[in-house]
């Protein structure tokens, strides 16, 4: 019989608003009061097993006690009504859970999208957390027809996909209702034609066709998405070279109406391009499609757009009446080769007479020439045709080169080695820059580059190493032959020397010592030696440092103490720091030469 509860709490399943007040009433049953000899005064209220202070109780009558909570801040409160029975034993009467939360906020920013081939999906912001189960329902209607409600799933409460087919060109009104145990609110209504919310499928079957007639164009063709039968489209076409990471875009005004092909112009010959395309409603109302799959195409070859860089070297050990000349040239970069270079054609004309032709697959040609003046020409050939000719005058043996560049400077900047000069007054056809690494261990093997006659500043185009000394030579080339070369040394990046100088004594006197050292080998300098510092000390004394100009190879220490052991070492400094050499010791004599004790 006592399995039946001794009483009950009202309300039974309360849902209350956070930070509000709440009152619960426990009503005891007569049979229970009789059995335990209790009344409402014996009621003890507990929350989550903690006793609530009596001040919060109100005895309503002999059977009922109430408890009031102010500013509820817990989301779940287990509230129990208990009675004190014989010998102060606590007996549970009834228990409830007080659930607290917030009413829903008005949903905001309602928007809809129709992905082609799918049904309309709308999404919204639901506002603050309610801590309660809150149902969101998307409502939609025509002026003449109500559509089935779309109930948002519990795991995606801020969006819903309708169950009916989208109808374009008929305005629809859409809104969201949010409801929980504490209230119901409605979003603002939005009214629109779904055709203005379309996200088309991307164009497909994108393909690229090149043109034999024009090496600067590629024609794109594609299949439009099915929605083309309903709306007019505009496009965004992007392209890049195969190895680039950034995309270029066709001007929007060129692709602003429905089409299924487009010719991209002003492309580089013999270059692989990657294309992609997306589309949207022509008037810009709606959403861009995703990008199509990418498609590649290669522009047709064009004749090389530039003559190769062209230079020569004369073997100094030439036989009587002849000299060995090595003609050399650079391969054209792809953007100038405009195709696969098949071969090079070299012609050599002795002054006003004999012509020799050579077809070469390499980038050099060694020829034996007389001591006369020659004119050499070079063209590069691909499938389409030949480049313009590079022309080089190889002067006669007795030619005296003059007119060098002036004010030659070289300096590192932005991880490149820059060279600049003042142009000679005479008309320069081109400049040849040669550079090599100076080393005590290996000969100076030169690389080279050509610059236009109008240039007076450039950077060396090669794989340059840090902390290596480069000897850079600039030769102006005139119509009648090369001018005088000018050279300069430079570093891409300096470092402290790898080794310090080894100091030794040249002569030691009673109060002075002449120190000497060798210049550091270029391989260990790692930069320009700006100065030396000599450090010397006695065993008991402080160290003294003396700065010495880098042009010196000896130095005299004066005011030394006689009959004393000195320790000396030397450091060499570049712009990036210094390095000490080994320590050396010497002892000053007790007496000067010829001095008697």
């Amino acid at each position: 019989e006592l399995l039946d509860p001794c009483g009950y709490i009202s309300p039974e399943s309360p849902v209350v608003q956070l930070h509000s007040n709440f009152t619960a009433v426990c009503v005891l049953k007569e049979k229970c009061m009789d059995y335990f000899h209790v009344n409402a005064n014996y009621i003890v209220w507990k929350t989550n097993h903690f006793t609530i202070p009596k001040e919060q109780y109100t005895i309503i009558n002999r059977t009922a006690s109430s408890v009031t909570f102010t500013d509820i801040s817990s989301l779940n409160i287990q509230l129990t009504c208990n009675i004190l029975t014989f010998g102060q034993l606590e007996q549970n009467v009834y228990g409830i859970t007080i659930i607290s939360g917030l009413p829903p906020e008005k949903p905001k920013n309602l928007s809809c999208i129709v992905n082609e081939g799918k049904k309309m999906r709308c999404e919204w912001n639901r506002g603050r957390e309610t801590h309660l189960e809150t149902n969101f329902t998307l409502k939609s209607e025509w002026a003449t027809h109500k559509f089935a409600d779309c109930k948002a799933k519990r795991d995606t409460p801020t969006s819903c996909t309708v169950d009916y087919s989208t109808v374009y060109f008929v305005n629809i009104e859409v809104w969201v209702e949010a409801e929980n145990a504490l209230g119901k609110v409605t979003s603002d209504h939005i009214n629109f034609d779904p055709v203005y919310k379309v996200k088309p499928n991307p164009p497909h079957n994108l393909s690229v066709i090149n043109s034999e007639e024009l090496s600067s164009i590629l024609k794109l063709t594609w299949t439009n998405p099915s929605i083309k039968s309903v709306i007019r489209l505009k496009y965004n076409i992007q392209y890049r070279t195969k190895d680039a990471s950034t995309w270029s875009q066709i001007p929007p005004e060129d692709t602003a109406s429905t089409r299924s092909s487009f010719t991209v112009q002003d492309l580089k010959p013999f270059t692989e391009y990657v294309f992609r395309i997306c589309c949207m409603k022509e008037d810009g109302k709606g959403y861009w499609s995703d990008w199509s799959e990418e498609a590649n195409g290669i522009t047709y070859e064009d004749r090389p757009s530039k003559a190769p860089s062209f230079w020569y070297k004369i073997d100094p050990s030439h036989a009587q009446g002849y000299r060995t000349v090595q003609l050399m040239w650079k391969t054209l970069p792809p953007f100038e080769a405009n195709g696969k270079i098949l071969d090079y054609e070299v012609t050599l004309t002795r002054w006003k007479s004999h012509l020799q032709n050579y077809t070469v697959n390499d980038t050099k040609l060694t020829v034996n020439l007389t001591n006369d003046r020659y004119v050499a020409t070079l063209t590069a050939r691909n499938l389409v045709g030949k480049s313009d000719a590079a022309v080089l005058t190889i002067p006669a043996c007795d030619f005296q080169a003059t007119h060098p560049v002036m004010d030659l400077k070289a300096f590192p900047k932005d991880n490149m080695l820059w060279v600049e000069w003042t142009t000679p007054r005479e008309s320069v056809k081109k400049y040849i820059l040669e550079w090599c690494v100076l080393s005590d261990k290996a000969p100076c093997i030169a690389d080279w580059q050509q610059e236009d006659g109008t240039v007076h500043r450039t950077h060396l185009r090669g794989n340059l190493a840090e902390s290596k000394c480069y000897l850079i030579t600039v030769t102006p080339v005139y119509a009648d032959g090369p001018g005088s070369p000018e050279s300069i040394k430079a570093y891409l990046k300096q470092a402290p020397p790898s080794k310090g100088p080894t100091v030794r004594t040249k002569k030691v006197g009673k109060n002075e010592a002449v120190l000497e050292w060798d210049q550091l080998p270029v391989d260990v300098q790692n930069g320009f030696i700006r100065n030396y510092t000599i450090f010397y000390r006695t065993i008991i004394g402080n160290e003294t440092a003396v700065n010495v100009d880098s042009s010196h190879t000896e130095y005299t220490l004066s005011s030394l103490t006689s009959d004393t052991l000195y320790m000396v070492r030397m450091a060499a400094y570049t712009d990036e720091g210094g390095k000490d050499g080994p320590e050396f010791t010497f002892t000053t004599p007790k007496f000067a030469q010829g001095e008697i004790e």
Partner: antibody
Framework: QVQLQESGPGLVKPSETLSLTCTVS????????WTWIRQPPGKGLEWIGH???????NYNPSLKSRVTISVDTSKNQFSLKLTSVTAADTAVYYC??????????????????????WGQGTTVTVSS | DIQMTQSPSSLSASVGDRVTITCRAS??????LNWYQQKPGKAPKLLIY???SLQSGVPSRFSGSGSGTDFTLTISSLQPEDFATYYC??????????FGQGTRLEIK
Amino acid sequence: QVQLQESGPGLVKPSETLSLTCTVSGGSISNYYWTWIRQPPGKGLEWIGHISNSGTTNYNPSLKSRVTISVDTSKNQFSLKLTSVTAADTAVYYCARLPLGIAAVDTDYYYYFGMDVWGQGTTVTVSS
Amino acid sequence: DIQMTQSPSSLSASVGDRVTITCRASQSISSYLNWYQQKPGKAPKLLIYAASSLQSGVPSRFSGSGSGTDFTLTISSLQPEDFATYYCQQSYSTPPITFGQGTRLEIK
């Protein structure tokens, strides 16, 4: 109450051009497709084509090379031109209104509504 | 083109009868089929659109059903004014719109 009235010659010579006009009264020409349908004597209905108020046209592929439909919104009229007619073009020609509304089902598209207002029809005979 | 085939081509019935006309599409047209009624010497009149939606002003004894390829027009209790020819029409938006060949409903 919207009404449609076809007008044009009842007799056209073979190889000439058939021209008909449909006048819309009692309502706007906007927000609808305006359709031409024909019915040869004792036969079924054949859709010729239609035009929207913005001028977008759709034609029956079997007639496309010979048909032009145009609209004049200022006069609330739309017209049909059918070139190079033969005796097979003899029919009752109807104009009709099709409310805008295209339903999307996957990537297929359907006119949602039916042709809800029709003219009474005009008989055109092709004969020399 | 989508072909529409109506059956029967003609049928005889009496006032008060329940009559069913069927229409079959050569490929799926979802639920986008319309039914028209045409009386001799008159223009067709729209009865049902989108397979089952009753056009405004049309008596409720007319009803439509079906989807995909098979559709029916039902007249629940035939009235004297219902004797006419009935056409189905598919409304696929890519041309052409096509009609069935018609079903002639006569008084028995």
